[in-house]
Amino acid sequence: YSHWPSCCPSKGYPSEELLRWSTVPVPPLKPASLDFHSVSCRASEDGPLNSRAISPWRYELDRDLNRLPQDLYHARCLCPHCVSLQTGSHMDPRGNSELLYHNQTVFYRRPCHGKKGNHKGYCLERRLYRVSLACVCVRPRVMG
Amino acid sequence: YSHWPSCCPSKGYPSEELLRWSTVPVPPLKPASLDFHSVSCRASEDGPLNSRAISPWRYELDRDLNRLPQDLYHARCLCPHCVSLQTGSHMDPRGNSELLYHNQTVFYRRPCHGKKGNHKGYCLERRLYRVSLACVCVRPRVMG
């Protein structure tokens, strides 16, 4: 819809703006469900969503300090099929555990080149970045 | 680790940088599974992930032109319980269909105030924004 220019902070930049950015409280984006204990193929009866799911998953960190957000988390399925709702452990071959993907907007820090080719701070470059969000229990596709 | 300042483009900014930002191919973030036909509580045997899931969901658009990304999508569960893997339609009370939430990093366009209080383009303000990503079939919590 609208065009957002990239931008390089210049030396004469108001310091209050610099502060305003860096003091926004952005904790590392560790999802509540970032739980590395649930690494087995079973659906728990307590704990975070990713361990109670019948398509359980764990999270893996993707960190790049030249990117915003710097920390992203990718889901990794712990089972090929869904876990039985009855037992919470045995797999049900009638259901597949599939990754749900999303193209997330991220911003990369890139050197800015002034008119004479010299570096002028950095520019932000917008990109789409593929992230796996969760594992979902689905009915297998029936080919027509 | 690092501080990323907010930034306001100034008038004397190289036009090629402005172009570089606006020409990055960022299509509207319509997930492959953005399908408003599957608004009933059933798990399909074809179609996108959100309609084949036994915890099916639909997407609702959240658009703000002063935010990056401008378009976000919120999942909305179509069933309170999970759909049976066997029939794809009857609900199984042993499983709950629960929303998976994520605090996504977004950027808001804000007026920039120069040293004399005058507007100088805009600044980007980083914030966490709660988005529902999907519906997940989970085993209900067992209270200890």
Epitope: L61, D62, R63, L65, N66, R109, R110 | Y1
Partner: antibody, heavy 123, light 108 residues
């Protein structure tokens, strides 16, 4: 100036575990990452794992189940622990500082290395 | 996981000659680095995020390339350049540092 120094046991018996300490000076462990790299005799470099300034760790996927990296910021020390050693783990083990900032970008190069510590796995 | 292949495995050159060695990646790489390792010494960073020269590295060294193809060039080889040269890439996910197999440079 920036310095890193590894200290290890030298000789380890097969199936036993290995512990190596990397002691650093000239910079703070909260501001940099530390990588562990090994080099078998006459062979190339192999990345083992890394610990960020905030303590987050990453491991070589092949060796993940056998490795553990931790640190003590106040003592300026990083620890590598490796379990179930075999003869093909015989190598020189290096720690290397990672992540430097040039005012524009962060770089993931290993800009300072220790002299390495030689580890022989033998009975 | 990305695999880096360096070629040639071994090469020799006379002082004053121009030397180029290559590093080929199995898929596109964002961050590429080059190291020099002399016999009995630790590796030393030469080039970071191609084509930047690390501190104290002579200007006869240069790095170029993008995507899957990178190269290290020494414009006029000197006797002290006898060493093994490694390329290395970093990726944020899966989080790995990968080294190439190395190119050994011998000076005639």
């Amino acid at each position: 100036q920036v310095q890193l120094k590894e200290s290890g046991p030298g000789l380890v018996a097969p199936s036993q575990s290995l512990s190596i300490t990397c002691t650093v000076s000239g910079f703070s462990l909260t501001d940099y990452g530390i990588n562990w790299v090994r080099q078998p005799p006459g062979k190339g470099l192999e990345w083992l794992g890394m610990i960020w300034g905030d303590g987050v760790t990453h491991y070589n996927s092949v060796l993940k189940s056998r490795l553990s990296i931790s640190k003590d910021n106040s003592m300026s020390q990083i620890f590598l622990k490796m379990n179930s050693l075999q003869t093909d783990d015989t190598a020189r083990y290096y720690c290397a500082r990672t992540l430097f900032y040039d005012g524009t970008l962060y770089y993931y190069a290993m800009d300072y290395w220790g002299q390495g510590t030689s580890v022989t796995v033998s009975s | 996981q990305i695999v880096l292949t360096q070629s040639p495995a071994t090469m020799s050159a006379s002082p004053g000659e121009k030397v180029t060695m290559t590093c080929s990646a199995s898929s596109s790489v964002t961050y590429m680095y080059w190291y020099q390792q002399k016999t009995g010494s630790s590796p030393r960073l030469l080039i970071y995020d191609t084509p930047n020269l690390a501190s104290g590295v002579p200007v006869r060294f240069s790095g170029s390339g993008s995507g899957t193809s990178y190269s290290l060039t020494i414009s006029r080889v000197e006797a002290e350049d006898a060493a093994t040269y490694y390329c290395q890439q970093w990726s944020s996910y899966p989080h790995t540092w990968t080294f190439g197999g190395g190119t050994k440079l011998e000076i005639k």
